[in-house]
Amino acid sequence: LQDPCSNCPAGTFCDNNRNQICSPCPPNSFSSAGGQRTCDICRQCKGVFRTRKECSSTSNAECDCTPGFHCLGAGCSMCEQDCKQGQELTKKGCKDCCFGTFNDQKRGICRPWTNCSLDGKSVLVNGTKERDVVCGPSPADLSPGASSVTPPAPAREPGHSPQ
């Protein structure tokens, strides 16, 4: 004999207390597949979480983060505080990027400026806390007629070894 529970559709649960009736999920719960013997409790988007998609009888709620925070982890399992560009989040809060590093987003860490000299290039635009350096053409590219780009400043840019 076929198990009657296997035919209970999504949005219901097979209620053994009630002679295996396919009972609609109670408030604030859902079943996303058929044949369930219980409904799962809906996720509640509280505090720094806010509701991106309401829970329905067949699907869980989805959360994102309130302004000033951003999602981390699968399904936005955590909210992390935003920082300004040029900062990174530490245990003590948002801190400015150290000299020689930058962060052009409101999240994540400060990363070292690109070392142009590793590619045999020169620094065209200096780096800041918010922006990486812009590497210019290599000195070899600056032979007459090769380029009309203004030569870079002397190669004692902050955070870079002399070329």
């Epitope: 076929q2 009657p4 296997s6 035919n7 209970c8 559709p9 949005g11 219901t12 207390n17 009630r18 002679n19 295996q20 009736i21 396919c22 009972s23 609609p24 999920c25 109670p26 408030p27 058929g34 219980t38």
Partner: antibody
């Protein structure tokens, strides 16, 4: 919107059978159990049985066991309740009701009056 | 069978005044999932019953917030904070927990 439209009034002789239909619209018919309830004049509501969601297996009140048959036609989104061996005490208004919330009949048909008279 | 007992049988009310109906069950209606399986329906004159409250205290969609349900286990109450003329009819409690599902005998609410 959800609607349950029942068949019209019936007059039957004692010993006969009656089959009441309940056509559902505005929702996925197979996703919710359908119950049948009757109300004799001046009496409380009396539950008769249900047709479950999914494959539509049935459960009946012991009071009507052997006399009532609840069926459904999913393709026509219609539930049926047949009561046999009618007697005068079966004269009542018969309702279909959807269990659309947990343990709750959120929509009812308009009722079908069945008169049993010789 | 679970026997549902309602009181009072009749309740004359004054519009604007509160009203309260009691329902007792012969067995606990608390499901293993933590919800009380008790519903309240109103049957207005000449109409089909309509759902007011389910799972003891949850108001059905479109039901005015002057209606509230409370209680747990075997003792339940339906309260109307301020009765309006349209609230007249017979109120039934119902248990959908065990077969057979059973209804209370009804409470007739009428305007004084």
């Amino acid at each position: 919107q959800v609607q349950l439209a029942q068949s019209g009034a019936e007059v039957k002789k004692p010993g006969a059978s009656v089959k009441v239909s309940c056509k559902a619209s505005g929702y996925t018919f197979s996703s919710f159990p359908m119950h049948w309830v009757r109300q004799a004049p001046g009496q409380r509501l009396e539950w008769m049985g249900w047709s479950n969601a999914g494959i539509g297996n049935t459960k009946y009140s012991q009071e009507f066991q052997g006399r009532v048959t609840i069926t459904r036609d999913t393709s026509a989104s219609t539930a049926y309740m047949e009561l046999s061996s009618l007697r005068s005490e079966d004269m009542a208004v018969y309702y279909c009701a959807r269990e659309g919330l947990t343990g709750a009949f959120d929509y009812w048909g308009q009722g079908t009056l069945v008169t049993v008279s010789s | 069978d679970i026997v549902m007992t309602q009181s009072p049988l009749s309740l004359p009310v004054t519009p604007g005044e509160p009203a309260s109906i009691s329902c007792r069950s012969s067995q606990s209606l608390l499901h293993s999932n933590g919800y009380n399986y008790l519903g309240w329906h109103l049957q207005k004159p000449g109409q089909s019953p309509q759902l007011l409250i389910y799972l003891g205290s949850y108001r059905a969609s479109g039901v005015p917030d002057r209606f509230s349900g409370s209680g747990s286990g075997t003792d339940f109450t339906l309260k109307i904070s301020r009765v309006e003329a349209e609230d007249v009819g017979v109120y039934y409690c119902m248990q959908p927990l065990q077969i057979p599902l059973t209804f209370g005998g009804g409470t007739k609410v009428e305007i004084k």
